[in-house]
């Protein structure tokens, strides 16, 4: 769900969840076009991650899931079922691939109309 | 179209052990986000979920039976295997396959029939 | 493990009818129940899942409602091809558990 999402983000760092509320083509609600920058493409792969949740059933923003935040690193269970394990993964992996990134204020608040038709194809 | 078939022997005497067989076809164990399951079914009682095993291999016992089961897959033949050693007559029951999804059950199978017997 | 009490364990109703049954989890399953009908001699058949949604080639007089811990099951005008036993199963939480079923007959 979206408070685990927030909290995995916050959990890692080094920004706050509030920075990629609408940042590039794909942080924030939908996406399309190309990924402006590392940023964004981190928030591409974590839009693939929850398609491929939702083609198996999953309701990426219903299910909730446990996890545990230790000296900045995210342990996600004890799941209950699938759904949990692998929506934890997709927020783990975005909040792991975050950490590591330039924060360009250039692609916040940027205009979607920038932003391709096209998107690449999740792998 | 998804089809699933059991296959088993039938009938054991007490400390014998199970092996079961599901056939399938339709879809692949290799495609992300579905699984094998079996439930059990004694005559005229509920339906008892005995384990899963997912595509990525992640199998899954329901917990008063774990040390007694175990799930396997052959995703290369379509099938997927349950073993439960050391049978008794509280295991006689009708023995369903299913596909499933995280959240629920998409296909059954049309069951096979288990009598443990002296 | 998750309990699911389903009621009635029988119900008669006439053709054209519309029926109902209920199903209720021990403990929150969100909307994570699924309807099954089973005919004499027959496969299982998926009719719902996530509470609500009607599984492909499922007719539109099968629905289903609720969240939480309650949950309703209703057909609309009931057909001859209807009669069967009908059961839920919370996905919540592994292992999957199942209602003790609904065996409908005919009036």
């Known amino acids: 769900g979206l408070l685990e999402l927030a909290g995995t983000l916050d959990c890692v760092g080094p920004r706050s969840p509030m920075a990629y509320m609408n940042y590039g083509c794909y942080c924030g609600l939908g996406g399309h076009g190309e990924p402006r920058d590392a940023i964004d493409w981190c928030c591409y792969h974590h839009d693939c991650c929850y398609s491929r949740a939702q083609d198996a059933g999953c309701s990426p923003k219903l299910d909730r899931y446990p996890w545990k935040c230790m000296d900045h690193h995210i342990l996600c269970g004890p799941a209950e079922n699938k759904c949990q394990e692998l929506l934890c993964r997709c927020d783990e992996e975005l909040a792991y691939c975050l950490a590591g990134t330039e924060y360009h204020l250039k692609y916040l608040f940027f205009p979607s109309i920038l932003c391709e038709k096209d998107s690449p194809k999740c792998n | 179209q998804v089809t699933l078939k059991e296959s088993g022997p039938g009938i054991l005497h007490p400390s014998q052990t199970l092996s079961l067989t599901c056939s399938f076809s339709g879809f692949s164990l290799n495609t992300f986000g579905l699984g094998v399951g079996w439930v059990r079914q004694p005559s005229g009682k509920g339906q008892e979920w005995l384990a899963h095993i997912w595509w990525d291999d992640d199998r899954y016992y329901n917990p008063p039976l774990k040390s007694r089961l175990t799930i396997s897959k052959d995703p290369s033949k379509n099938q997927v295997f349950l073993t439960i050693p050391n049978v008794n007559t509280a295991n006689t029951a009708t023995y369903y396959c299913?596909?499933?999804?995280?959240?629920?059950?998409?296909?059954w199978g049309q069951g096979t029939t288990l009598t443990v017997s002296s | 493990d998750i309990q699911m009490n389903q009621s009635p364990s029988s119900l008669s109703a006439s053709l054209g009818d519309t029926i109902t049954i209920s199903c209720h989890a021990s403990?929150?399953?969100?909307?994570?129940l699924s309807w099954y009908q089973q005919k004499p001699g027959n496969i299982p058949k998926l009719l719902i899942y996530k509470a609500s949604n009607l599984h492909t080639g499922v007719p539109s007089r099968f629905s289903g409602s609720g969240s939480g811990t309650g949950f309703t099951f209703t057909i609309s005008s009931l057909q001859p091809e209807d009669i069967a036993t009908y059961f839920c199963?919370?996905?919540?939480?592994?292992?999957?558990?199942f209602g003790g079923g609904t065996k409908l007959e005919l009036k």
């Open positions: 199963q919370q996905g919540q939480s592994y292992p999957f558990t």
């Open positions: 299913t596909q499933i999804l995280p959240h629920w059950v998409a296909y």
């Open positions: 403990q929150n399953i969100n909307v994570w």
